[in-house]
């Protein structure tokens, strides 16, 4: 089903994608699910949304916009936002919350790029991504304040109050409500 975009556009030149599959046209596949996904558009040189049918298709398909950009846009990761301290945050700090596929109930922390703070989340116990820390300190050290001194002080107290932990049990299957962006 997947067909490659023809490579006749000479002005693409230095804009060659990182992987050959980034040049493939968006392919929704034969199935009838409606899954919001992203693909790299060779002509606009941007990652764009499309609706995936749920089976087959091709490799130019990503669950998140971030994943698409990282995989197909040359130099994207090098332009990642730098922390105020001047030290660069690892790319995984910008990954969206991913509880994984399993049904466990692990209290973890992630860096929220919107609030610019480390926050608690429920992790299912397998898979997911590297924006996932066992302790608040570890998350802060790596993503909130890379290369800086340790946090501490009033900010920690306010944050601890802000993220009162709900002790309700885990959802029965994380994958029923897995994020689609």
């Amino acid at each position: 089903l997947s067909e490659e975009a023809d490579d006749t556009d000479s002005e693409l030149g230095s804009m060659k994608p990182l992987h050959t599959f980034c040049a493939m046209k968006a392919d929704d596949g034969p199935c009838k699910a409606m899954i919001r996904s992203y693909f790299f558009n060779m002509y606009t040189h941007q990652c764009e949304e499309f609706i995936y049918g749920g089976c087959e298709g091709n490799e130019n398909r990503f669950d998140t916009l971030e994943e698409c950009k990282k995989t197909c846009i040359p130099g994207y990761e090098k332009t990642a936002v730098k922390a105020a301290s001047g030290a660069e945050r690892p790319d995984f700090c910008f990954l969206e919350e991913d509880p994984g596929l399993c049904r466990g109930y692990m209290k973890r922390y992630l860096y929220n790029n919107q609030t610019k703070q480390c926050e608690r989340f429920v992790y299912g116990g397998c898979l997911g991504n590297r924006n996932n820390f066992e302790t608040l300190d570890e998350c802060k050290k790596i993503c909130e304040n890379p290369g800086g001194g340790s946090g501490g002080g009033l900010n920690d107290i306010f944050e601890a109050q802000k993220i009162e932990w709900h002790e309700g049990g885990p959802p029965h299957h994380h994958h029923h409500h897995h994020h689609h962006h």
């Epitope: 699910a33 899954i35 749920g54 089976c55 669950d63 991913d98 994984g100 596929l101 399993c102 049904r103 466990g104 692990m106 299912g124 116990g125 397998c126 898979l127 997911g128 991504n129 590297r130 996932n132 066992e134 299957h173 994380h174 994958h175 029923h176 897995h178 994020h179 689609h180």
Partner: antibody, heavy 120, light 113 residues
Framework: EVQLLESGGGLVQPGGSLRLSCAAS????????MSWVRQAPGKGLEWVSA????????YYADSVKGRFTISRDNSKNTLYLQMNSLRAEDTAVYYC?????????????WGQGTMVTVSS | QSVLTQPPSVSGAPGQRVTISCTGS?????????VHWYQQLPGTAPKLLIY???NRPSGVPDRFSGSKSGTSASLAITGLQAEDEADYYC????????????FGGGTKLTVLG
């Protein structure tokens, strides 16, 4: 009875492609995450890929990222593994497994496996 | 080289008790991930033996038990029987690999005749 039946294995040349299928029966297929695990001849087990029940989230081992694509068709109760740019080191028995059904995060039920041989 | 380390082989006489160790690190077993154990009889697919460190699926005899402490786990088999001769694998997940599944290299259990 819960059953998983893999098919699609065979002999393929390096650089070639193959699509494995795993037909599921005896349970509500769309409710469960599924995974592929492989075992090279005489070697141990290696996790390959996993997919959520809806098919909306997929995960891959670094060794196959960019080459393999996991997908599922819930209307056909079938799991797939599209394998491209195959290498000699991909030679293995490929098992499909239900992930976290009765357990929280184990590979609960396994198929009997299908053999993939990559050789010129 | 497997992420989780198991002894390549263990052996015991019928009726004896044997243990198989599975040693990990702070990014897998030590990070709070569950450990699971699988039994693979010769020429067959693996079968879940112990899940969530110490739980037995229905149908698995209580001669099999699992435990976890710190960065390691172990599988104990008591009252060894000839049909227990198989390969045994531990499995967990690893945060340094984005939570990917990781296995031990496997342990061949020989029941001495």
């Amino acid at each position: 009875e819960v059953q998983l039946l893999e098919s699609g294995g065979g002999l393929v040349q390096p650089g070639g492609s193959l699509r494995l299928s795993c037909a599921a029966s005896g349970f509500t297929f769309s409710s469960y995450a599924m995974s592929w695990v492989r075992q090279a001849p005489g070697k141990g087990l290696e996790w390959v890929s996993a997919i959520s029940g809806s098919g909306g989230s997929t995960y891959y081992a670094d060794s196959v990222k960019g080459r393999f694509t996991i997908s599922r068709d819930n209307s056909k109760n079938t799991l797939y593994l599209q394998m491209n740019s195959l290498r000699a080191e991909d030679t293995a028995v490929y098992y499909c497994a239900i992930l976290g059904a009765t357990s929280l995060s184990a590979f609960d039920i396994w198929g009997q496996g299908t053999m993939v041989t990559v050789s010129s | 080289q497997s992420v989780l380390t198991q002894p390549p082989s263990v052996s015991g006489a019928p009726g004896q008790r044997v243990t198989i160790s599975c040693t990990g690190s702070s990014s897998n077993i030590g990070a709070g991930y569950d450990v699971h154990w699988y039994q693979q009889l010769p020429g067959t697919a693996p079968k879940l033996l112990i899940y969530g460190n110490s739980n037995r699926p229905s149908g698995v005899p209580d001669r099999f038990s699992g435990s976890k402490s710190g960065t390691s786990a172990s599988l104990a088999i008591t009252g060894l029987q000839a049909e227990d001769e198989a390969d045994y694998y531990c499995q967990s997940y690893d945060s340094s690999l984005s939570g990917s599944g990781v296995f031990g290299g496997g342990t061949k259990l020989t029941v001495l005749g």
